[in-house]
Interface confidence: medium
């Protein structure tokens, strides 16, 4: 594993699973507050590859509710507001870290988990396969 | 604080900051392996709102490398392959959870942190402000 120069003020973990199990401070630091970005919340309707948001709930996970983007059309919206099937709406996917209670129902023990979520959709030129 | 029906196998936290500090197992469970999704790795070039990927590295953070999307153009690529400035390329942003070593350089002590990343770009109809 990785060797890290040790800070003398580090907490000492006696856990037999160390370094697999670590202490995590849940007082979440939000690095976004200074930049205060414009939420992308209206893009789902204004995009040429618009999407709907679907709810996925799991009470043993943080965050418990995840909204998944599903592209509305196979094609993309053209200048006339019609669906153009010569282009494709595709989901942009991202892996995110979530926390899962483990063992279940334990208030202070979690496992880090990676899940794939669709964040939104983009319009792409299709890959055309020519048959000989 | 909250009362949770306690699993008899739960680890017991004697930490004075509980429940702000919890144990997290870093042996990451990846929920994506079975689904084997088609990666969106070529979409950044094929999109009508193409983007470049920039590497953001921070050894005090997990994951230490995060790829950030930056839209290539203000407008979108039209059918002729030219940039159409009547449409806008915009980043689709997502908050992700990361772990930050705290205190710095401690191998087994982290704080949960939220950071905003741009995952890709989508093409949207602009909001036109009419001046009276």
């Amino acid at each position: 594993g990785i060797t890290i120069p040790r800070n003398p003020g580090c907490p000492n973990s006696e856990d037999k699973n160390f370094p697999r199990t670590v202490m995590v401070n849940l007082n979440i630091h939000n690095r976004n507050t200074n930049t205060n970005p414009k939420r992308s919340s209206d893009y789902y309707n204004r995009s040429t590859s618009p999407w709907n948001l679907h709810r996925n709930e799991d009470p043993e996970r943080y965050p418990s509710v995840i909204w998944e983007a599903k592209c509305r059309h196979l094609g993309c919206i053209n200048a006339d507001g019609n669906v153009d099937y010569h282009m494709n709406s595709v989901p942009i996917q991202q892996e995110i870290l979530v926390l899962r209670r483990e063992p279940p129902h334990c208030p202070n023990s979690f496992r880090l988990e990676k899940i794939l979520v669709s964040v939104g959709c983009t319009c792409v030129t299709p890959i055309v396969h020519h048959v000989a | 604080g909250i009362t949770i029906p306690r699993n008899p196998g739960c680890p017991n936290s004697e930490d004075k900051n509980f429940p702000r500090t919890v144990m997290v197992n870093l042996n990451i469970h990846n929920r994506n392996t079975n689904t084997n999704p088609k990666r969106s790795s070529d979409y950044y070039n094929r999109s009508t709102s193409p983007w470049n990927l920039h590497r953001n590295e921070d050894p005090e953070r997990y994951p230490s490398v995060i790829w950030e999307a930056k839209c290539r153009h203000l407008g979108c690529i039209n059918a002729d392959g030219n940039v159409d400035y009547h449409m806008n390329s915009v980043p689709i942003q997502q908050e992700i959870l990361v772990l930050r070593r705290e205190p710095p350089h401690c191998p087994n002590s982290f704080r949960l942190e939220k950071i905003l990343v741009s995952v890709g770009c989508t093409c949207v109809t602009p909001i036109v402000h009419h001046v009276a």
Epitope: N36, R39, P59, V65, I96 | -
Partner: antibody, heavy 126, light 107 residues
């Protein structure tokens, strides 16, 4: 559809404490937080504090720090708000409100109050 | 704390008229602004979340716009049942804060 049902009206004397309950039904209790908001007669809404069920973390408005305690019991899906050192200024309707714990449209945690209890009237009078 | 200032404080409107209520934040709050309707002796009800997102079950005549510091709630074609007090609420920074409210009544 989540429903929040609060305990009944209370009449208290100055210096006493009041504890109000908020029973949730319909939906997973751990999938949201509960905030407490009060409204003095003829006045606007004032946030007192809230609890994030998933981690059991509480946050309080500075004005109420040290006087308010918010707790929750997952086994009964009930949240509680206790306010001590009551004065006549604490006469108000107290509401519990659901705060979803969502990863919504690419963002962790939503903070709108999408469901409210019916309110509990607390009267403080000597 | 972030201060939200609503205007006007009071509005008397004829049915079918368009109503516009504004909410100004003392600092940039992105789109972390929500609108509620409260009728006499009732609990508040969520109308719009995140500045412009409509809520299932809320009539389409209610809409929201704005970002940063300036936000607007619009009622397109007021109906008698819309007589209520309307509050804006910011969730960008703790503590959550509310505007002072705008009372809308029917002429």
């Amino acid at each position: 559809e989540v429903q929040l049902v609060q305990s009944g009206a209370e009449v208290k004397k100055p210096g006493e404490s009041v504890k109000i309950s908020c029973k949730a039904s319909g939906g997973s209790f751990r999938s949201y937080g509960i905030s407490w908001v009060r409204q003095a007669p003829g006045q606007g809404l004032e946030w007192m504090g809230g609890i994030t069920h998933f981690f059991g973390i509480t946050d309080y408005a500075q004005k109420f720090q040290g006087r308010v305690t918010i707790t929750a019991d997952e086994s009964t899906t009930t949240a509680y708000m206790e306010l001590s050192g009551l004065t006549s200024d604490d006469t108000a309707v107290y509401y519990c409100a659901r705060e979803p714990n969502d990863f919504w449209n690419g963002y962790y945690d939503t903070h709108d109050f999408d469901s409210w209890g019916q309110g509990t009237t607390v009267t403080v009078s000597s | 704390e972030i201060v939200l200032t609503q205007s006007p404080d009071f509005q008397s409107v004829t049915p079918k008229e368009k109503v516009t209520i504004t909410c100004r934040a003392s600092q940039n709050i992105g789109s972390e602004l929500h609108w509620y309707q409260q009728k006499p002796d009732q609990s508040p009800k969520l109308l719009i979340k995140y500045a412009s997102h409509s809520i299932s079950g809320v009539p389409s005549r209610f809409s929201g716009s704005g970002s940063g510091t300036d936000f607007t709630l619009t009622i397109n074609g007021l109906e008698a049942e819309d007589a209520a007090t309307y509050y804006c609420h910011q969730s960008d920074t703790l503590p959550h804060t509310f505007g002072q409210g705008t009372k809308v009544d029917i002429k």
